[in-house]
């Protein structure tokens, strides 16, 4: 175009519907210039105007010829331009912030603006740039892009931004601009101008303030603190660590803490100091709640559900910042909250949830929440399978009869729909405990009853009980123990009875043993002894317990003696024994030796013995009648071990084995023996009966049984040259080769001649007896042989 004609045609649009085209006037033209603008499109349009710009409707795609005629005083000039959409710039109108507000407690800015979308013909993407500036010096803090879409109508947009620095610390400015990224527009797209700036500031009073106050943050976070002050701030500390000051407007300062450490329960102090004062705030650095661990729900009573859990990792936040828990049941929509006062027991927390009528399956979600976050755990539970009964209370025992009792107890809860498995522990004194399991139908009223049989009469039992449901989840704790004595019953057996004739053979002495408690079935009060023959029955007067012996004058006819034990309920069956022994001519006395504590006796099976066998024993040295104790063993036995606290080693006892038929006893074997053999306590007394020049005859006596302390097995006779009261060695001193020893194993031998001796020589003689228990002490003598004649 010529310089004297209109030139530099440019077109812009702010809404894609109208193009605003402007040009530069020809040089030298004044105010009174008119323009004729013609646009060559389908219909030739011309416009008359007095200014250097024109708004025209947006042209469709393609090239258009624009003719601008300038008409002025000194003539006219014409310029032709080719106009295409690609030559047009899209520059949106300057946006305006409708509202800027702040939430100081969260340091968040809230921005509101209108996109004026109604002026645009079709949908377009819009990019917004939001600029945050801080301090009076308007330092750029943040430049963010935010995408929206134009949808043909005016839309309000909201945007928020959380500041890393508390908003109270400094003035914050915000401005926005936009860029319309229209797919339908092929021209140049440009950013709008920045909006007028808006700001937010905190109105301080005259007091110095530190921000934020009581903030809860995640361990490891970064945080900024500031002090709004009229005085010069000299230092800042977090805990004991000095922090570099960041200067804000006026005397205001800030500090930035990176990667903050976990706080103590009282929080972490942040302190600013001035010349004269100190100002503080507390920060609580902790963790969000961990997922509740080991969530478990059970019921004690089918009325209330108890859910327990472990909080997991500690949050380091306490008091009002501690984790709060809510237990939600999704089928019913009901929930309960954990009250902080219900402090955790041994590291686990618990909550009670009221059971709902006719609901057995519960879907629990436990929500944990603290200022830093939330977490949850879920559990699906059929509560009838998770019954942990209370400890049974009011546990009582009542008699039914002597072998049965009734147990009653209280188990709180409504268990009408389930069965219990209860375990009863039965303990008899000094015996192992027995456990019996019983199944009981659950009831609504909490009272339970069970009968227990197969007990022993007159026995002290200790009972206790625990219960679980039949489907078994947990045993209840054991109830208190209840001690109970069952009632008496008649004695189940007659006393174990024996008899001996007195030493003069005129009286029969009857002995019996007290009945064991499990046969006495009560306290034995007395005994009845009676004596019967074919002609008559004679009853002795009642013998009170604890007397266990009676004496009757009897002739040598055969009598049957009966002994009956009586308690408060009644009498035992009679124990019967014949007064006379069945003779046995073929009897030898045998030797037996025990095993330290007792003695094993064996015998051959004898089918004639129909009632039992009796082993009787006594101390050999005691006078008649020989009875220390007796033991009955069944008729099918062929051996027994006799043990008694009265047995002593080295004491000789007589043992008698009797067999019984028709209440009559026959002596089958007679034995003497020791529980344990010991060495003799004395040496045999010996004398020299005769001496010659080359021999000596020695004679000795028996050792009494009491001193023998075992079965005599032989003698040891030592002899050798030796003189009394000299330094020459004694016979028994070791290492002497001239000592001679004779072992005499024939215990009936009582003399010994020693030959081949030297005449007129002194000999030392020593005699010792031995048993299987050892060698006894020595007896010694010095003898001088005669001179050779």
């Amino acid at each position: 175009q010529k310089k004297g004609a209109p030139h530099d045609l440019k077109c812009v649009t702010n809404n894609l519907q109208v193009w605003d085209c402007y040009w530069k006037a020809p040089s030298g033209t004044g105010r009174g210039t008119d323009y004729e603008v013609c646009i060559e499109n389908r219909s030739h349009s011309c416009y008359q105007l007095e200014k250097t710009n024109i708004k025209i409707p947006a042209l469709s795609h393609g090239d258009y010829e624009i003719t601008i005629n300038s008409l002025h005083d000194f003539g006219s000039s014409t310029s032709k331009f080719t106009l295409n959409e690609q030559n047009v710039s899209l520059i949106p109108d300057t946006p305006e912030i409708l509202n800027l507000s702040a939430d100081f407690s969260t340091s968040t800015l809230y921005l509101k603006w209108n996109d004026r979308g109604s002026v645009f013909p079709h949908h377009s993407n819009v990019i917004w740039e939001i600029k945050i500036l801080r301090k009076e010096s308007m330092e750029l803090v943040k430049l963010v892009t935010h995408n929206t879409t134009l949808n043909g109508k005016d839309t309000l947009h909201h945007w928020s931004w959380a500041s890393d620095m508390p908003l109270e610390c400094a003035i914050h400015f915000v401005e926005i601009r936009c860029y319309i990224d229209s797919l339908h527009f092929s021209g140049r797209k440009e950013w709008s101008d920045w909006s007028p700036v808006k700001n937010i500031s905190w109105m301080p009073d005259s007091q110095t303030k530190v921000f934020p106050q009581d903030k809860v943050i995640l361990v490891g976070s970064d945080i900024t603190f500031c002090c709004i002050s009229q005085e010069k701030v000299l230092s800042a500390l977090i805990g004991h660590t000095n922090c570099p000051l960041i200067h804000l407007d006026g005397e205001n300062v800030a500090i930035k803490i990176h990667n903050i450490s976990v706080s103590a329960s009282s929080g972490t102090n942040v302190v600013f100091t001035t010349e004269d004062n100190i100002f503080g705030t507390v920060i609580f650095a902790g963790y969000p709640p961990d997922t509740p661990q080991q969530l478990n729900c059970e019921t004690h009573d089918l009325k209330e559900i108890l859910c327990r859990w472990n909080p997991g990792r500690a949050t380091a936040l306490v008091g009002p910042r501690a984790t709060s828990y809510t237990l939600l049941e999704s089928f019913s929509g009901k929930y309960v909250r954990f009250k902080r006062a219900e402090a955790p027991t041994n590291g686990s927390y618990q909550l009670f949830f009221q059971m709902l009528p006719n609901q057995e399956i519960y879907n629990f979600t436990l929500n944990a929440h603290n200022p830093l976050g939330r977490s949850e755990s879920t559990i699906l539970v059929n509560i009838t399978e998770k019954v942990y009964p209370h400890t049974p209370t009011s546990f009582k025992v009542k008699d039914i009869n002597s072998t049965a009792v009734k147990l009653s107890w209280h188990l709180p809860g409504n268990f009408a729909k389930i069965n219990f498995l209860c375990q009863i522990e039965i303990k008899k004194s000094n015996t192992v405990q027995e456990q019996r399991n019983v199944t009981i139908k659950g009831v609504e009223n909490s009272s339970y009853l069970v009968a227990l049989d197969k007990l022993n009469p007159y026995t002290v039992y200790t009972f206790r009980i625990r219960c679980s449901t039949e489907t078994f989840w947990k045993w209840s704790k054991w109830s208190n123990k209840k001690q109970h004595l069952t009632t008496e019953a008649i004695p189940s057996k007659g006393p174990d009875t024996w008899r001996e004739w007195s030493s003069d053979g005129k009286n029969l002495i009857i002995y019996w043993k007290p009945l064991p408690i499990n046969e006495a079935n009560g306290k034995i009060l007395s005994y009845n002894v009676s004596c019967s023959s074919d002609e008559e029955t004679q009853s002795l007067s009642e013998i009170p317990d604890p007397q266990h012996k009676a004496e009757i004058q009897l002739d040598k006819n055969d009598y049957i003696i009966s002994v009956v034990a009586k308690n408060s309920v009644g009498s035992s069956p009679p124990s019967k024994i014949a007064s006379m022994e069945i003779p046995n001519d073929d009897l030898k006395i045998e030797q037996v030796v025990g095993m330290g504590k007792g003695i094993l006796l064996t015998w051959h099976y004898d089918p004639n013995m129909t009632c039992d066998y009796v082993i009787k024993w006594c101390n050999s040295s005691r006078s008649e009648p020989c009875l220390m104790d007796w033991r009955k063993v069944p008729s099918n036995s062929t051996e027994t071990v006799i043990e008694s606290d009265q047995f002593r080693p080295g004491v000789r006892y007589n043992f008698f084995l009797y067999g019984c038929r028709n209440q009559g006893y026959q002596l089958l074997r007679s034995m003497i023996g020791y529980i344990e053999e010991l060495a003799p306590t004395v040496a045999p007394n010996f004398t020299v009966e005769d001496t010659s020049a080359d021999s000596i005859l020695v004679k000795w006596e028996d050792i009494p049984v009491e001193e023998l302390r075992g079965f005599l097995r032989g003698y040891l006779f030592y002899f050798g040259k030796g003189e009394r009261d000299t330094s020459k060695m004694r016979v028994l001193e070791s290492g002497r080769s001239d000592i001679k020893v004779k072992n005499i194993t024939d215990i009936s031998q009582k003399t010994l001649r020693i030959a081949d001796l030297q005449g007129k020589t002194s000999y030392h003689l020593v005699l010792r007896a031995y048993t299987d228990g050892g060698v006894g002490p020595e007896k010694s003598m010095y003898v001088v042989t005669k001179e050779n004649s």
């Epitope: 929080g267 100190i278 100002f279 705030t281 008091g319």
Partner: antibody, heavy 122, light 108 residues
Framework: QVQLVESGGGVVQPGRSLRLSCAAS????????MDWVRQAPGKGLEWVAV????????FYADSVRGRFTISRDNSQNTLYLQMNSLRAEDTAVYYC???????????????WGQGTLVTVSS | EIVLTQSPGTLSLSPGGRATLSCRAS???????LAWYQQKPGQAPRLLIY???SRATGIPDRFSGSGSGTDFTLTISRLEPEDFAVYYC?????????FGPGIKVDIK
């Protein structure tokens, strides 16, 4: 057990000086901030001064700033309050108090002495 | 400075009764920096509550504290004979550390 024993109180004329001491025992004195608090007869409590556990900082109530000096001797487990230019309105029972938090700043006062009476009178 | 006001000035109650003592600050106080003390005649004060709600060592659980910002409360749930005394609130978050004027709890 923690014990704080104040001494040095008495009757003094206006304009004169007095030095109060507080002997501490039963705790690690050098790890706790210490304060002086006073109570005029029949009146409420008034905070007077604080000194940090290490003695690095001291702060005062406006009513005593420039006249009173708080100090401590950690080797002797003793806290001091040097009171100059005393006035009638300084008449009070003076308590020394230990701050609750071990090695912390800005704490409540968990242990107090039995107090010593300062009477400023002509 | 932060001014603390306490109300009521005197509280007359019977043993077993519930006492609610109020403390108001002239400007916001961090709850972490508010304490309550009890003082009996002729004795030094005794720390009851710190951090607005935490009980000091050995303080019975009938004493509880609550509140935030400018309004704080000390509650004694069941007054025992030994609880009749003067109660002070204190802020220790910025110097000068200030006490309230005190509330006297006496026997009705």
């Amino acid at each position: 057990q923690v014990q704080l024993v104040e001494s040095g109180g008495g009757v003094v004329q206006p304009g004169r000086s007095l030095r109060l001491s507080c002997a501490a025992s039963g705790f690690t004195f050098s790890s706790y901030g210490m304060d002086w608090v006073r109570q005029a007869p029949g009146k409420g409590l008034e905070w007077v001064a604080v000194i940090w556990y290490d003695g690095s900082n001291k702060f005062y109530a406006d009513s005593v700033r420039g006249r009173f000096t708080i100090s401590r001797d950690n080797s002797q487990n003793t806290l001091y309050l040097q009171m100059n230019s005393l006035r009638a309105e300084d008449t009070a029972v003076y308590y020394c108090a230990r701050e609750l938090w071990f090695g912390e700043l800005l704490s409540p006062f968990d242990f107090w002495g039995q107090g010593t009476l300062v009477t400023v009178s002509s | 400075e932060i001014v603390l006001t306490q109300s009521p000035g005197t509280l007359s109650l019977s043993p077993g009764g519930r006492a609610t003592l109020s403390c108001r600050a002239s400007q916001s106080v961090s709850s972490s920096y508010l304490a309550w003390y009890q003082q009996k005649p002729g004795q030094a004060p005794r720390l009851l509550i710190y951090g607005a709600s935490s009980r000091a060592t050995g303080i019975p659980d009938r004493f509880s504290g609550s509140g935030s910002g400018t309004d704080f409360t000390l509650t004694i749930s069941r007054l025992e004979p030994e609880d009749f005394a003067v109660y002070y609130c204190q802020q220790y978050g910025s110097s000068p550390f200030t006490f309230g004027p005190g509330i006297k709890v006496d026997i009705k």
